[in-house]
């Protein structure tokens, strides 16, 4: 989801935005800081063993609107938050995993109907 009531259509920023990156640092990042024309993000998702993993970084403007929308994916617990209001704003994002549905207990992460 987007923070601070941003509109859904991404608009070009006049200046570069710096974001904290963790587990998601591109080659052009320095000291765990990446640069973007789009958004900073923090995401939490379950790995294959069901352990919550937090990643953060930069999303380019192209496609970021879709990525920040946080559409539910079947059989995948994941949540993402995006921000642009200041540099390293994603330090203050704390997305939480959506609650487990009953169906998820039955299916497990690898069984598909």
């Amino acid at each position: 989801k987007k923070e601070d009531g941003e509109s859904t259509a991404p608009t070009a920023r006049p200046k570069v935005l710096r974001c904290k990156c963790h587990h998601h640092c591109p080659e052009d990042s320095v000291n765990n800081i990446c640069s973007t024309d789009g958004y900073c993000f923090t995401m939490i998702e379950e790995d294959d063993s069901g352990t919550p993993v937090v990643t953060s970084g930069c999303l380019g403007l192209e496609g970021s609107d879709f990525q920040c929308r946080d559409t539910p994916i079947p059989h995948q617990r994941r949540s993402i938050e995006c921000c642009t209001e200041r540099n390293e704003c994603n330090k203050d994002l704390h997305p939480t995993l959506p609650p487990l549905k009953d169906r998820d207990f039955v299916d497990g992460p690898i069984h598909h109907k």
Partner: antibody
């Protein structure tokens, strides 16, 4: 029109500090970063660092950490660079510049001479 | 740090001739957003640099169309199709993909 005004030459003694200014006009000051660049004769251009006036966020070239300190006063749309413990190596022209994703406008530069 | 190597260091040309300046970077300048932040500036004697070309090939406002930029990855070129007297000065390439941002050492365009 976009302008970055820098004062005339500065003459300082070795060991002293100096605070260079850069007054921006013709655009929204907080919408762009301000960068500082050093130019010594025959030594090309050297990026010192940059500051985002909207949140005072700074990035420095490692070579200038401890030497340069960047600040802004948004009420007067002015950026500052303080240089400390000056030596003859710091004698140069110092430019401020507006930066979005690239530098599009430069100040006219302030010539700093460090000499006893 | 990314090293920007410009050639030639000096370029003597006749007025009306074409001039070409090369800039090579020690690593790719393609940013993770897909943009390539390679730019060209002209510095005339006693003046501050002026932006000519941004992001490889985009002419800045007011820059004559005799200036053009091209290239990709690590290899870039600035071309002036017909050199005029007002084009004389030192040309710099610059990258803003990697921190710290770096500049080429400059190419001095002078009259032959």
């Amino acid at each position: 029109q976009v302008q970055l005004q820098q004062p005339g030459p500065e003459f300082v003694k070795p060991g002293a500090s100096v605070k260079l200014s850069c007054k921006a006009s013709g655009y929204t000051f907080t919408s762009y970063w301000v960068q500082w660049v050093k130019q010594r004769p025959g030594q090309g251009l050297e990026w010192i660092g940059e500051i985002d006036p909207s949140d005072n966020y700074t990035l420095y070239n490692q070579n200038f950490k401890g030497k340069a300190t960047l600040t802004v006063d948004t009420s007067s749309s002015t950026a500052y660079m303080q240089l400390s413990s000056l030596t003859s190596e710091d004698s140069a022209v110092y430019y401020c510049a507006r930066f979005g994703f690239y530098v599009d406008y430069w100040g006219q530069g302030t010539t700093l001479t460090v000499s006893s | 740090d990314v090293v920007m190597t410009q050639t030639p260091l000096s370029l003597p040309v006749s007025l009306g001739e074409q001039a070409s300046i090369s800039c090579r970077s020690s690593q790719s300048l393609v940013h993770s957003t897909g943009n390539t932040y390679l730019h060209w500036y002209l510095q005339k004697p006693g003046q501050s640099p002026k932006l000519l070309i941004y992001k490889v090939s985009n002419r800045f406002s007011g820059v004559p169309d005799r200036f053009s930029g091209s290239g990709s990855g690590t290899d870039f070129t600035l071309k002036i199709s017909r050199v005029e007297a007002e084009d004389l000065g030192v040309y710099f390439c610059s990258q803003s993909t990697h921190v710290p941002f770096t500049f080429g050492s400059g190419t001095k365009l002078e009259i032959k």
